[in-house]
């Protein structure tokens, strides 16, 4: 079972992931981003449910498409190159979701824009941070 120190580490990793996702959202929502309309045409798969750490499997599977869309954005909107940003997120996600490799993601029927996708995972991080004990 997780210890108080491992739970604290999990909280910190979730906060880091939350900040990264918020940074991406702010970057693409930037009024100076001329590629936003184009970026909004890309569709992302949404998790059927996202309440627990194991559901991060669904985020992991969409990181490559996320990187591809971010490559469209002007790099000055982000502190890091999309490849480095997504790599950092991937490391956190892999640690958070654990080694339960047999867990398969199930997706919702409807796809979403990058903004809806990011908002969903931001909500996920916020809710776990507030309820993890």
């Amino acid at each position: 079972a997780p210890t108080s120190s491992s739970t604290k580490k999990t909280q910190l990793q979730l906060e880091h992931l939350l900040l990264d996702l918020q940074m991406i959202l702010n970057g693409i929502n930037n009024y100076k981003n001329p590629k936003l309309t184009r970026m909004l045409t890309f569709k992302f798969y949404m998790p059927k449910k996202a309440t627990e750490l194991k559901h991060l499997q669904c985020l992991e599977e969409e990181l490559k498409p996320l990187e591809e869309v971010l490559n469209l954005a002007q790099s000055k909107n982000f502190h890091l190159r999309p490849r480095d940003l997504i790599s950092n997120i991937n490391v956190i996600v892999l640690e958070l979701k654990g080694s339960e490799t047999t867990f398969m993601c199930e997706y919702a029927d409807e796809t979403a824009t990058i903004v809806e996708f990011l908002n969903r995972w931001i909500t996920f991080c916020q809710s776990i941070i507030s309820t993890l004990t």
Epitope: K48, K49, A50, L53, K54, A108, S130
Partner: antibody, heavy 117, light 107 residues
Framework: EVQLVESGGGLVKPGGSLRLSCAAS????????LAWVRQAPGKGLEWVAA???????YSPDTVRGRFTISRDNAKNSLYLQMNSLRAEDTAVYYC???????????WGQGTLVTVSS | DIQMTQSPSSLSASVGDRVSITCKAS??????VGWYQQKPGKAPKALIY???FRYSGVPSRFSGSGSGTDFTLTISSLQPEDFATYFC?????????FGGGTKLEIK
């Protein structure tokens, strides 16, 4: 057949403690998130705590620091340790299975906890 | 926390009637909504998941609909055993929250 059977309820004084148990059968216990949901007399349902398959635990502000959820996969059992009990904790406590991708699909019959002096 | 506002809180109807119960979420919850039936002194029983899918063994007269913030449970033709209290629940995010319940009574 999935079965969840709660036990451990009873009368306790304010400030006291109680430990509830839930014995599970009919499914691969270790693979599921389990939850406790309570219902005060004549009232609605309130989610109290959950524990996932990795034993990470989740609970709302109302019980955090007082209630602790735990599980023993070897015994197919779920527990709720309730400390510093208050009159407003009086309720029927249900154990429920949280399906991986959907709602709370199976519920136990409940156990009544009464907090009164 | 996400609030689930259920209406009506009570409803009188007759056997054979068609009835609908609504639930409104305080924010978008996609289709992460379940419906439960509870009879006096008994545990809740899961009826509907993902807003519109019936659990195995649930009669076809029960149907769910909705997405986003507005959800409906409909019983197409009330049977005597359907008189009970019904609850909606969101499982979009922790903490899970429930509607206040709708008590369905015989007219």
């Amino acid at each position: 057949e999935v079965q969840l059977v709660e036990s451990g309820g009873g009368l306790v004084k304010p400030g006291g403690s109680l430990r509830l148990s839930c014995a599970a059968s009919g499914f691969t216990f270790s693979s599921y998130t389990l939850a406790w949901v309570r219902q005060a007399p004549g009232k609605g349902l309130e989610w109290v705590a959950a524990i996932d398959s990795s034993s990470y635990t989740y609970s709302p502000d109302t019980v955090r620091g007082r209630f602790t959820i735990s599980r023993d996969n070897a015994k197919n059992s779920l527990y709720l340790q309730m400390n510093s009990l208050r009159a407003e904790d009086t309720a029927v406590y249900y154990c429920a299975r949280d399906s991986n991708w959907d709602a709370l699909d199976y519920w136990g019959q409940g156990t009544l906890v009464t907090v009164s002096s | 926390d996400i609030q689930m506002t259920q209406s009506p809180s009570s409803l009188s109807a007759s056997v054979g009637d068609r009835v609908s119960i609504t639930c409104k979420a305080s924010q978008n919850v996609g289709t992460n909504v379940g419906w439960y039936q509870q009879k006096p002194g008994k545990a809740p029983k899961a009826l509907i998941y993902s807003a519109s899918f019936r659990y195995s063994g649930v009669p076809s007269r029960f149907s769910g609909s909705g997405s986003g913030t507005d959800f409906t449970l409909t019983i197409s033709s009330l049977q005597p055993e359907d008189f009970a209290t019904y609850f909606c629940q969101q499982y979009y995010t922790y903490p899970y929250t429930f509607g206040g319940g709708t008590k369905l009574e015989i007219k």
